[in-house]
């Protein structure tokens, strides 16, 4: 049994860990495969993830940990029975890969805005809660050709748009993903889109 | 009442062994670290030896690394310390002492909080 | 290894008067924002030590709020903000951010 491309991990900067590696032929990771990991700290003990299948030959295992903080290294194992397949260390402070954003809510009851609203990930005692920025992809269904990404760099959870700038009687999606500009992270996944239909109509004299 | 009671000690000549005790009630022995501290007589404190919760990580001060080996048994909730090719600096009086809650990924410290009531060990010939 | 180095060696005081003693890490104790890992212990005589102030500045329980513990990275210092007949012993700051476990050389508060 051999490891073909070693264990990646991204923490979430709040309690899990995510490692995911590819072995060299198919296999049972919850069966044949543990990942251990301990903290590289006094007394700390050794804990034990089981790894989840993640395509044929892929493994990954989400650790389970307390809240991050700079300092923190762990080593890892990655075990097949007694066989030692592989070894590194993970500091998870350095491999920061953002929870993604929730509740993305569209507001078309606002005027001539459309209003874009979702909540932060993490709670306010988080260092990362003060530290995200956004990316809110709006395309639609309708129109192929319509994709846009607004960056939100300010604090606040939301986007207001034109609804003019937006084609009328159409359906539209959006997403919302977030990344820690001091924190050097990965972006964060998509959240889960949501659909909206634009019905606003331009005031007759500016047609 | 969380308590420690250290046993063992006594008058052994050098080179000779001993094995000191420390049991531990009123708390979820199991959970916590233990730690070994020794006292010489009208010196201050320090530290011997400390172990992990499921006695997986040792640790061990230089003087006494190769001679003591920490151990416990959590179905006895008993911490032992055995002292093996004793010197005569090793006479002290030996405290036990619970330390860090060390079930969590990163253990959790509220100082050394008990300690035994001491047992003296003096090397003599 | 973690050198600890308590002053004064010596501490006379009148009761009801303040006391403090410094404690100086040779390295960091501070492992991540308010988590100092330096304690503080009296030792009366006769008895075990007892553990007062745990990760620079968190009272233990039972013990009277006048005594206190401040200072971060590689300075510590531990205050009675009025000193009590039965406070009189020795105190000891030692670091448990790694093994081995370092104790200051302690410090004799004696009254007056």
């Known amino acids: 049994m051999k490891v073909l491309q070693e264990p990646a991990c991204v923490s979430d900067y709040m309690s899990i860990s995510t490692c995911e590696w590819k072995m060299g032929g198919p296999t049972n990771c919850s069966a044949e495969l543990r990942l251990l990991y301990q903290l590289v700290f006094q007394s700390s003990e050794t804990h034990t993830c089981v790894p989840e299948n993640n395509g044929g030959v892929g493994c990954v295992c989400h650790l389970l940990m307390d809240d991050v903080v700079s300092m923190d290294n762990y080593t890892l194992d990655l075990w097949a029975g007694q066989q030692l397949l592989w070894k590194g260390s993970f500091k998870p402070s350095e491999h920061v890969k953002p929870r993604a954003p929730g509740n993305l809510t569209v507001h078309t009851n606002v005027s001539d805005t459309v209003l874009l609203t979702w909540s932060n990930p993490y709670p306010p005692d988080n260092y990362l809660y003060n530290d995200l920025t956004y990316a809110v992809n709006i395309w639609s269904e309708n129109d192929p050709a319509y994709s846009r990404i607004h960056n939100v760099t300010y604090l606040k959870p939301t986007l207001r748009i034109p609804a003019s700038t937006l084609k009328s009687g159409i359906s539209y999606r959006a997403r919302v993903r977030a990344w820690a500009q001091h924190y050097n992270t990965t972006w964060s996944e998509w959240s889960p889109s949501t659909k909206w239909y634009n019905s606003y109509r331009e005031p007759f004299e500016q047609r | 009442e969380v308590q420690l009671v250290e046993s063992g000690g006594g008058l052994e000549q050098p080179g000779g062994s001993l094995r000191l005790s420390c049991a531990g009630s009123?708390?979820?022995?199991?959970?916590?670290?233990m730690t070994w501290v020794r006292q010489a007589p009208g010196k201050g404190l320090e530290w011997v030896s400390s172990i992990s919760g499921s006695g997986g990580n040792k640790y061990y001060a230089d003087s006494v690394k190769g001679r003591f080996t920490i151990s416990r048994d959590n179905s006895k909730n008993t911490l032992y310390l055995q002292m093996n090719s004793l010197r005569a600096e090793d006479t002290a009086v030996y405290y036990c002492?619970?330390?860090?809650?060390?079930?969590?990924?990163?253990?959790?410290?509220?100082?050394?909080?008990?300690w035994g009531q001491g047992t003296t060990v003096t090397v003599s010939s | 290894d973690i050198v600890m180095t308590q002053s004064p060696l010596s501490l006379p005081v009148t009761p009801g008067e303040p006391a403090s003693i410094s404690c100086t890490a040779s390295q960091s104790l501070l492992y991540s924002i308010g988590y100092n890992y330096v304690d503080w212990y009296l030792q009366k005589s006769g008895q075990s030590p007892q553990l007062l102030i745990y990760?620079?500045?968190k009272r233990a329980s039972g013990v009277p709020d006048r005594f206190s513990g401040s200072g971060s990275g590689t300075d510590f210092t531990l205050k009675i903000s009025r000193v009590e007949a039965e406070d009189v012993g020795f105190y000891y700051c030692m670091q448990s951010l790694t093994s081995p476990y370092t104790f200051g050389q302690g410090t004799k508060l004696e009254i007056k």
């Open positions: 009123g708390f979820t022995f199991t959970d916590f670290a």
């Open positions: 002492a619970k330390d860090r809650l060390s079930v969590t990924v990163r253990p959790r410290y509220y100082g050394l909080d008990v």
């Open positions: 990760l620079g500045n």
